[in-house]
């Protein structure tokens, strides 16, 4: 390389990360194996759980405004879970990104898309519940499944828009020990006349904006909505929280616990540009809190089920039905199950809690399985605990 050839410009914190070398320490190797195992398990669980939630809520339940929110949350979590196997591979090959720059950008973007989408959707759920209680007449007239889908579409668009900088500034950087990092490189595009200033301002802007937009603002909306609802319900003499309240509370708590540490370390990382003493703490902590944030997508489906009564009994029954469906003779399948389409109108008003507590006749195992295999969301809505919790919108 000639003396005049300017090396790829990197921010100091990134260049120092590229200088860190791996050790073949036995205890570190053991931790790495454990991490690969844990992330591999989380990948599998996340994909299965969110896939099941998407299928059950999207195809096996009566569509309401609440099921729409959960459907989109599960979709966001499924996306994040789908990216986890690649992160597991990154860990398995010794913390080196071997999948190229484009995929590095895409993979990271999914993580941030999930971060923004989760925050925005939880805000929408809380505002929706607040409007139901504070403006019941307006809610009765305007709360439709179609409207909820439109809101979700807008929120997804906002999430994508907020993810663009993370896509643009993600890059693959070669470490001096031969490994490859997939990380922020804020000097990648138009570094400006002064790299130090650009590094400081862009890293701070990214950290603060994601903390505000994907964490603080959603939590503020959730908290204020909850306060407004609590005050209104106190006046009405309501005491015990309904099923949906418990579900939302659990999901919000998981969101705060899983994403909170990530944002703390992200802000510390921004400070570490000017304060190198913080860098070792950030380098040690960020991988853990990033994994914790990923695991939020695995935790959510569990929470949907756990916050509903009779969970284990219903779960066992569902599993038995699925097994019966799978183990049935080919000759018994026939052509059943694919003809019946879901009759719920896309603009149907959200059902009252009582409307979904009755038990319509369920299609038998083979019919349900075939309906699923043929891509039909045909079977009648199920009324298990999850359904009841997701449908109890007035609580």
């Amino acid at each position: 390389m000639s003396a005049n050839a300017t090396l790829k410009p990197l921010c100091p914190i990134l260049e120092q990360m590229s200088r860190l070398q791996s050790h073949s320490n036995t205890s570190i190797r053991y931790i790495d194996h454990a991490a690969v195992l844990l992330h591999g398990l989380a990948s599998l669980l996340g994909l299965v759980e969110n896939g099941v939630i998407l299928f059950v809520v999207g195809c096996r339940m009566r569509q309401t405004v609440v099921t729409t929110w959960v459907l989109h949350l599960a979709l966001s979590d499924l996306l994040a879970s789908a990216s986890l196997p690649f992160f597991t591979y990154f860990l398995a090959v010794g913390h080196s990104w071997e999948l190229g720059t484009t995929f590095c950008k895409l993979h990271s973007s999914i993580f941030f898309l999930n971060m923004f989408a989760s925050g925005f959707l939880l805000s929408a759920i809380s505002l929706d519940r607040c409007l139901q209680v504070v403006r019941p007449v307006w809610a009765q007239n305007h709360r439709t499944v179609a409207a909820a889908h439109k809101v979700c579409l807008v929120l997804w668009a906002l999430a994508v828009l907020n993810t663009v900088p993370y896509f643009v500034f993600r890059d693959t950087i070669s470490r001096l020990d031969g490994r490859i990092m997939c990380y922020y490189n804020v000097l990648l595009l138009n570094p400006g006349p002064d790299r130090d200033a650009t590094c400081n301002s862009r890293q701070a802007a990214l950290a603060v904006s994601k903390f505000l937009l994907a964490f603080l603002v959603p939590l503020a909306i959730i908290a204020s909505s909850h306060a407004a609802v609590s005050l209104r319900l106190q006046h009405r003499g309501r005491r015990r929280p309904g099923r949906f309240v418990r579900l939302v509370a659990a999901v919000v708590a998981a969101f705060a616990l899983c994403w909170g540490p990530y944002h703390v370390f992200s802000l510390l990382e921004a400070r570490a540009h000017a304060n190198p003493g913080l860098r070792p703490l950030v380098w040690r902590g960020l991988p853990f809190v990033t994994s914790l944030a990923f695991f939020n997508s695995v935790a959510n489906p569990v929470l949907y089920v756990l916050t509903c009564p009779d969970m284990l009994r219903k779960l066992r029954r569902s599993l038995r039905t699925v097994l019966e469906s799978v183990l049935v003779d080919d000759s018994e399948l026939g052509g059943a199950g694919s003809s019946r389409r879901r009759r719920t109108s896309s603009t149907a008003r959200s059902a009252s809690p009582l409307a979904l507590c009755s038990r319509p006749e369920e299609p038998r195992g083979p019919a349900r399985l075939l309906g699923w295999l043929l891509g039909s969301c045909a079977a009648s809505p199920q009324t298990g605990p999850l359904n009841r919790a997701l449908s109890s919108t007035s609580s």
Partner: antibody, heavy 118, light 107 residues
Framework: EVQLVESGGGLVQPGGSLRLSCAAS????????MSWVRQAPGKGLEWVAR????????DYPGTVEGRFTISRDNSKNTLYLQMNSLRAEDTAVYYC???????????WGQGTLVTVSS | DIQMTQSPSSLSASVGDRVTITCRAS??????LAWYQQKPGKAPKLLIY???QLAEGVPSRFSGSGSGTDYTLTISSLQPEDFATYYC?????????FGQGTKVEIK
């Protein structure tokens, strides 16, 4: 070929001021961070100041902070070191050095001698 | 400030000898270390950066190793032109300090 040429050194009385210059050529000056390093006669090396490629950020060790000011003029490909309130212990050969990336001085000038004496 | 302690302060060796110079930092410097060679009346020359990386145009007989607080410069087979003073310098937290130097002399 990369070249760094220091000038402005000389004899100065304690408490006096001096401005050193470093003319750069053979590379894109505005793309590189720059530093000043000094070496007292028969002694080791001491880093004195550092400036970012655009000039917005500067750093100094405690020994010179508040007395020395590093600056640059990218249009003239020149680095400067303004030295005020000079002391006898500031007597040294002053080198300007180019940073390889954010650190590591890969090219040095030939140095200019500053003598602080009454 | 981080203190850099070089040892030995001087050594005598013959052409063809293997020479090792060590540099110890008062705290972990995370591989942010450079080695320089300086000959009398000349400016220093970069040999090694990031603790282990050979600078451009430097002969392969020079190598750097180490981690944490302890770093080493090795000259595998000393050549006549290698008789000089060697300095280590950290680039972790400012101020970036140098070691006091190791003078390699002809035995």
């Amino acid at each position: 070929e990369v070249q760094l040429v220091e000038s402005g050194g000389g004899l100065v009385q304690p408490g006096g001021s001096l401005r050193l210059s470093c003319a750069a050529s053979g590379f894109t000056f505005s793309s590189y961070l720059m530093s000043w390093v000094r070496q007292a006669p028969g002694k080791g090396l001491e880093w004195v100041a550092r400036i970012s490629n655009g000039g917005s950020t500067t750093d100094y060790p405690g020994t010179v902070e508040g007395r020395f000011t590093i600056s640059r003029d990218n249009s003239k490909n020149t680095l400067y070191l303004q030295m005020n309130s000079l002391r006898a212990e500031d007597t040294a050969v002053y080198y300007c050095a180019r940073h390889r990336t954010n650190w590591d001085f890969d090219y040095w000038g030939q140095g200019t001698l500053v003598t602080v004496s009454s | 400030d981080i203190q850099m302690t070089q040892s030995p302060s001087s050594l005598s060796a013959s052409v063809g000898d293997r020479v090792t110079i060590t540099c110890r930092a008062s705290e972990n410097i995370y591989y942010n270390l450079a080695w320089y060679q300086q000959k009398p009346g000349k400016a220093p020359k970069l040999l090694i950066y990031a603790a282990t990386q050979l600078a451009e145009g430097v002969p392969s007989r020079f190598s750097g190793s180490g981690s944490g607080t302890d770093y080493t410069l090795t000259i595998s087979s000393l050549q006549p032109e290698d008789f000089a003073t060697y300095y280590c310098q950290h680039f972790w937290i400012t101020p970036w300090t140098f070691g006091q130097g190791t003078k390699v002399e002809i035995k």
